[in-house]
């Protein structure tokens, strides 16, 4: 017997659906109506036929009471080919729900998203995460999606993007966005970062994550941030192959004084990079290739320094920097 496509945990909290049949029984998902966190994986199916069954132009207000009764707070939709019109229809209906976090992964969005009707209500998300989502509309996808959201988005994560650069002139500002995660876009690079960080569109960013994004030097990142007017408190550059030296012809970059936490772990560094901020609260240099203890003049003024997992560090060795935090145990790097 084939397993049930949807499983609801015994506390009505998590519901997971895996629709792998060519002709799935979508009604099985109704058992998820009481769940708080819902994951729907569509097995790579093309959802185009759905458009024939639903009236994408119907007034979503007729579903308002039904949708308000849903407990869902976090929704993940994955592995499908979705017509943009269907996505928009879902967003319009979900605007009446309690949904706060939406994750889209392994999706191919076909067609263009229609503009938001004047009477429509945007979706009040606090978090939007996209992983391996391709859009037929190319660089304008963020601007098109943004119009269907209320302006209170706090967390935006875009991984494995087919087009990580945005059409900046079309994008409106994200006034409440405090966390931007562009990690796992290895082709982004410092030029791509400049294109993705639309100037003055991200005024409230506190946390910027750029893990595995093809960054080359901290100084190059500093320049991209300065050009965009982005002043994060926390910057994650881990899992990039960083060069410690700076191109002598490159202009010196002044880091924002707002930056107090910098993660340079797993960056293949053989020495402390030049051009770091003068003062930091937290600096993570763990799991690099430092063959000797950094000298005080190589390091910023830092309260909390992590050097675990570097070759020079034998467990139990005296710490090289005042106020540093080191477990003395070499982590699995």
């Amino acid at each position: 017997t084939t397993p049930e496509p949807c499983e609801l945990d015994d506390e009505d909290f998590r519901c997971v659906c895996n629709f792998s049949e060519p002709q799935p029984d979508w009604s099985e998902a109704f058992q998820c109506v009481s769940a708080v966190e819902v994951e729907i994986h569509a097995g790579g199916l093309n959802l185009e036929p759905f458009l024939k069954r639903v009236d994408a132009d119907a007034d979503p207000r007729q579903y308002a009471d039904t949708v308000k009764a849903l407990r869902v707070r976090r929704l993940t939709v994955g592995a499908a080919q979705v017509p943009a019109q269907l996505l928009v229809g879902a967003l319009r209906v979900l605007a009446y729900s309690r949904l706060k976090e939406l994750t889209l992964e392994d999706l191919k969005i076909t067609g263009t998203m229609p503009p938001l009707p004047l009477e429509a209500t945007g979706l009040a998300l606090s978090s939007l995460r996209l992983r391996n989502v391709s859009w037929a509309t190319g660089r304008s996808w963020l601007a098109e999606l943004q119009q269907w959201l209320k302006p209170g988005l706090k967390v935006l994560s875009i991984a494995q993007a087919h087009s990580p650069a945005f059409s900046c002139e079309q994008v409106r500002a994200f006034p409440a966005l405090t966390s931007l995660d562009l990690s796992d876009n290895p082709g982004l690079g410092e030029r791509g970062l400049m294109a993705a960080l639309c100037p003055h569109k991200f005024p409230a960013i506190q946390n910027l994550a750029l893990r595995n994004t093809g960054m080359e030097t901290p100084t190059g990142v500093c320049a991209a941030l300065a050009a965009a007017g982005v002043q994060p408190h926390s910057l994650d550059l881990s899992h990039n192959s960083l060069r410690a030296t700076v191109n002598p012809s490159a202009p010196r970059c002044m880091w924002s004084s707002a930056l107090n936490s910098l993660n340079l772990s797993f960056a293949g560094l053989e020495q402390v990079p030049k051009g770091l901020p003068a003062k930091l609260r937290v600096l993570d240099l763990s799991c690099n290739r430092l063959n000797r203890a950094p000298q005080p003049d190589e390091l910023p003024e830092v309260d909390n320094l992590t050097l675990d997992g570097n070759p020079f560090l034998v467990p139990g060795t005296a710490l090289p920097h005042e106020g540093s935090m080191n477990s003395g145990v070499v982590p699995a790097c």
Epitope: D9, E11, R14, V36
Partner: antibody, heavy 115, light 111 residues
Framework: QVQLQESGPGLVKPSETLSLTCTVS?????????WNWIRQPPGKGLEWIGY???????SYNPSLKSRVTISRDTSKNQFSLKLSSVTAADTAVYYC????????WGQGTLVTVSS | EIVLTQSPATLSLSPGERATLSCRAS??????????LHWYQQKPGQAPRLLIY???NLQSGIPARFSGSGSRTDFTLTISSLEPEDVAVYYC?????????FGQGTKLEIK
């Protein structure tokens, strides 16, 4: 059988940050469910503070949201509460609890806010 | 937020009597077929203990003299025949919508 155990200082000074950790045994906090903090001031009723879910998603009581952070350490199967800028009104027994129908409770730890 | 109001504040009964505790919600705590209203018992110095979940389901290990009923906004916890060990404070709680809220409690005393 899932077991939860709170730990942390029993005395915190006003304006400082209260920090508690809940260690979970017999169940992985990344499997499913919500992992909550609930408190009870002496002689009073129960108040939900917030949760971190199996996915890492958080939800907080709006009355405390500006002061609360709930985080987790999946390698230790622990989740933690930080409550900043505490006052005497934050003196309470703090419980860590699994689920949204609260079937599994820690034994609770009394935190007193006093100078 | 959903406000839960419990009544009476105190209930004083004799062993063997039937206890009826009420919980009223400021708005519906139903989501489709389920009522997300739960009942707890708390004895002095102990953590609360789940008695009834989703309005009418008896939590495992709880004696059958405890039962729950109701839907939408009106709920009742019934103890069919009071035992001396039932002296405690009883709380209702809703998990239909965050913030998840508790009633103020009903104190059950034995005469």
């Amino acid at each position: 059988q899932v077991q939860l155990q709170e730990s942390g200082p029993g005395l915190v000074k006003p304006s400082e940050t209260l920090s508690l950790t809940c260690t979970v045994s017999g169940y992985s906090i990344t499997s499913d469910s919500a992992w909550n903090w609930i408190r009870q001031p002496p002689g009073k009723g129960l108040e939900w503070i917030g949760y971190i879910s199996y996915s890492g998603s958080t939800s907080y009581n709006p009355s405390l949201k500006s002061r609360v952070t709930i985080s987790r350490d999946t390698s230790k199967n622990q989740f933690s509460l930080k409550l900043s800028s505490v006052t005497a009104a934050d003196t309470a027994v703090y419980y860590c609890v699994r689920g949204l129908r609260f079937a599994y409770w820690g034994q609770g730890t009394l935190v007193t806010v006093s100078s | 937020e959903i406000v839960l109001t419990q009544s009476p504040a105190t209930l004083s009964l004799s062993p063997g009597e039937r206890a009826t505790l009420s919980c009223r919600a400021s708005e519906s705590v139903d989501s489709y077929v389920n009522s997300f209203l739960h009942w707890y018992q708390q004895k002095p110095g102990q953590a609360p203990r789940l008695l009834i979940y989703r309005a009418s389901n008896l939590q495992s290990g709880i004696p059958a003299r405890f039962s729950g009923s109701g839907s939408r906004t009106d709920f009742t916890l019934t103890i069919s025949s009071l035992e001396p060990e039932d002296v405690a404070v009883y709380y209702c709680q809703q998990s239909n919508e965050d913030p998840y809220t508790f009633g103020q409690g009903t104190k059950l005393e034995i005469k």
